[in-house]
Interface confidence: low
């Protein structure tokens, strides 16, 4: 990895497992200052591979609410509104970081956790396996 | 928010800003134990709204490398391989949590940050504004 030059004004850590356990300020800084007109807003409805958003809630996790996309169809929607089953609607998935309370129910102690979430759906050409 | 019952075995916090500053164990627990066959692997190439993945690197951030999707075309790819400009390829975006070193260069002190990333692209019917 890249060597990080140590800043003399850093908080000290007496944790034996340092740097595995770190201090994190939960006052979230949001870098998305400008409202992006391309934000996924209504794409879930206008897409040729439309999806529904399901709420996933877990009080032991931070953030506690995550929205999960589920593709509406196996195929893709054509211009006439019918579904084309020669194409496939598939979920676009991404690994994201969340904080998991550890030990459970502790308000100030977390472990970093990676989870896989479906963000939306896209229409793909299926992989056809020809039998010899 | 939801009240979290306090566990008597929790680490103590003498931080005046508690619970804004918390301890986080960076030993990542990966909940994606099974290899998911639907993982977005080659969808970026097979999609009717294909995308390229650009590496975004920042040593002051955790994770330091994030892959950003950029749609290849303004339109969507038809079955014959040509691009249909009556449809639009648009990025599916998601807000994700990252850790930002704060103060800068400190190895054990972070602030939680929300950033907007493009995960992939989907093909949508454009919104047409008719001029009266």
């Amino acid at each position: 990895g890249i060597a990080i030059p140590r800043n003399s004004g850093c908080p000290n850590s007496e944790d034996k497992n340092f740097p595995r356990t770190v201090m994190v300020n939960l006052n979230i800084h949001n870098r998305n200052t400008s409202t992006n007109p391309k934000r996924s807003s209504d794409y879930y409805n206008r897409s040729t591979s439309p999806w529904n958003l399901h709420r996933n809630e877990d009080p032991e996790r931070y953030p506690s609410v995550i929205w999960e996309a589920k593709c509406r169809h196996l195929g893709c929607v054509k211009a006439d509104g019918n579904v084309d089953y020669h194409m496939n609607s598939v979920p676009i998935q991404q690994e994201i970081l969340v904080l998991r309370r550890e030990p459970r129910h502790c308000p100030n102690s977390f472990r970093l956790e990676k989870i896989l979430v479906s963000v939306g759906c896209t229409c793909v050409t299926p992989i056809v396996h020809h039998v010899a | 928010g939801i009240a979290i019952p306090r566990n008597s075995g929790c680490p103590n916090s003498e931080d005046k800003n508690f619970p804004r500053t918390v301890m986080v164990n960076l030993n990542i627990h990966n909940r994606n134990t099974s290899t998911n066959p639907k993982r977005s692997s080659d969808y970026y190439n097979r999609s009717t709204s294909p995308w390229n993945l650009h590496r975004n690197e920042d040593p002051e951030r955790y994770p330091s490398v994030i892959w950003e999707a950029k749609c290849r075309h303004l339109g969507c790819v038809k079955a014959d391989g040509n691009v249909d400009y009556h449809m639009n390829s648009v990025p599916i975006q998601q807000e994700i949590l990252v850790l930002r070193r704060e103060p800068r260069h400190c190895p054990n002190s972070f602030r939680l940050e929300k950033i907007l990333v493009s995960v992939g692209c989907t093909c949508v019917t454009p919104i047409v504004h008719h001029v009266a």
């Epitope: - | 190439n45 294909p50 950029k70 290849r72 691009v83």
Partner: antibody
Framework: EVQLLESGGGVVQPGRSLRLSCAAS????????MHWVRQAPGKGLEWVAV????????YYADSVKGRFTISRDNSKNTLYLEMNSLRPEDTAVYYC?????????????????WGQGTTVTVSS | QSGLTQPPSASGTPGQTVSISCSGS????????VNWYQQVPGAAPKLLMY???QRPSGVPDRFSVSQSGTSASLAISGLQSEDEADYYC???????????FGSGTKVTVLG
């Protein structure tokens, strides 16, 4: 008319430095990624470097990494290639080229506008 | 060492179809769309095709491309004398972290 005009080439001794410039006109320079591509005498095209529209991202060919620096001045509509520790194998015609789509694209839309090239000769 | 391999030469008589192959790997053609360039002697290269078979304005539809797996090809139908040039395929390569050109193919129009 969209145009790219390279300058700064010449004859230089091995180990010395040279700075190439590429003046852009006829398009909004600050919206487009830009490349440098070179062609040694009688040889094929070799990609050198690319810079994003805002200068935040730069990528280099292994053969020039650590020796060449690509940069841009959007206020002057100019692309640069700073070449240090020059070697005889750097002898070539150097072209600057514009990415075919505005925004954060590096190659998908191809390199749609090319300059006429400037010749760099590294020889003792 | 180019990441993309092309035949050094190809030829045909006027009116014929000539195909040029471009072979790569998963990190380049297998992951990205291929661009094609034409370079006539003494001139700068010119973009011929990009994306999935898209032509810049002014490029005749005699030029067509295909791409599958880790290879791509350019076909020139109804070959004309002005098509005599060097042709290069190019794309992004993830493992190199950069743009890569093919070795180039010289097309000769016979007769």
């Amino acid at each position: 008319e969209v145009q790219l005009l390279e300058s700064g080439g010449g004859v230089v001794q091995p180990g010395r430095s040279l700075r190439l410039s590429c003046a852009a006109s006829g398009f909004i320079f600050s919206n487009y990624g830009m490349h440098w591509v070179r062609q040694a005498p009688g040889k094929g095209l070799e990609w050198v470097a690319v810079i994003s529209y805002d200068g935040s991202n730069k990528y280099y060919a292994d053969s020039v990494k650590g020796r060449f620096t690509i940069s841009r001045d959007n206020s002057k509509n100019t692309l640069y290639l700073e070449m240090n520790s020059l070697r005889p194998e750097d002898t070539a015609v150097y072209y600057c080229a514009k990415v075919g789509a505005s925004g954060d694209y590096y190659y998908s839309y191809g390199l749609d506008v090319w300059g006429q090239g400037t010749t760099v000769t590294v020889s003792s | 060492q180019s990441g993309l391999t092309q035949p050094p030469s190809a030829s045909g008589t006027p009116g014929q179809t000539v195909s040029i192959s471009c072979s790569g790997s998963n990190s380049n053609i297998g992951s990205h769309s291929v661009n094609w360039y034409q370079q006539v002697p003494g001139a700068a290269p010119k973009l011929l095709m990009y994306g999935i078979g898209q032509r810049p304005s002014g490029v005749p539809d005699r030029f067509s491309v295909s791409q599958s797996g880790t290879s791509a090809s350019l076909a020139i139908s109804g070959l004309q004398s002005e098509d005599e040039a060097d042709y290069y395929c190019a794309t992004w390569d993830d493992s190199l972290g950069g743009y890569v050109f093919g070795s180039g193919t010289k097309v000769t129009v016979l007769g």
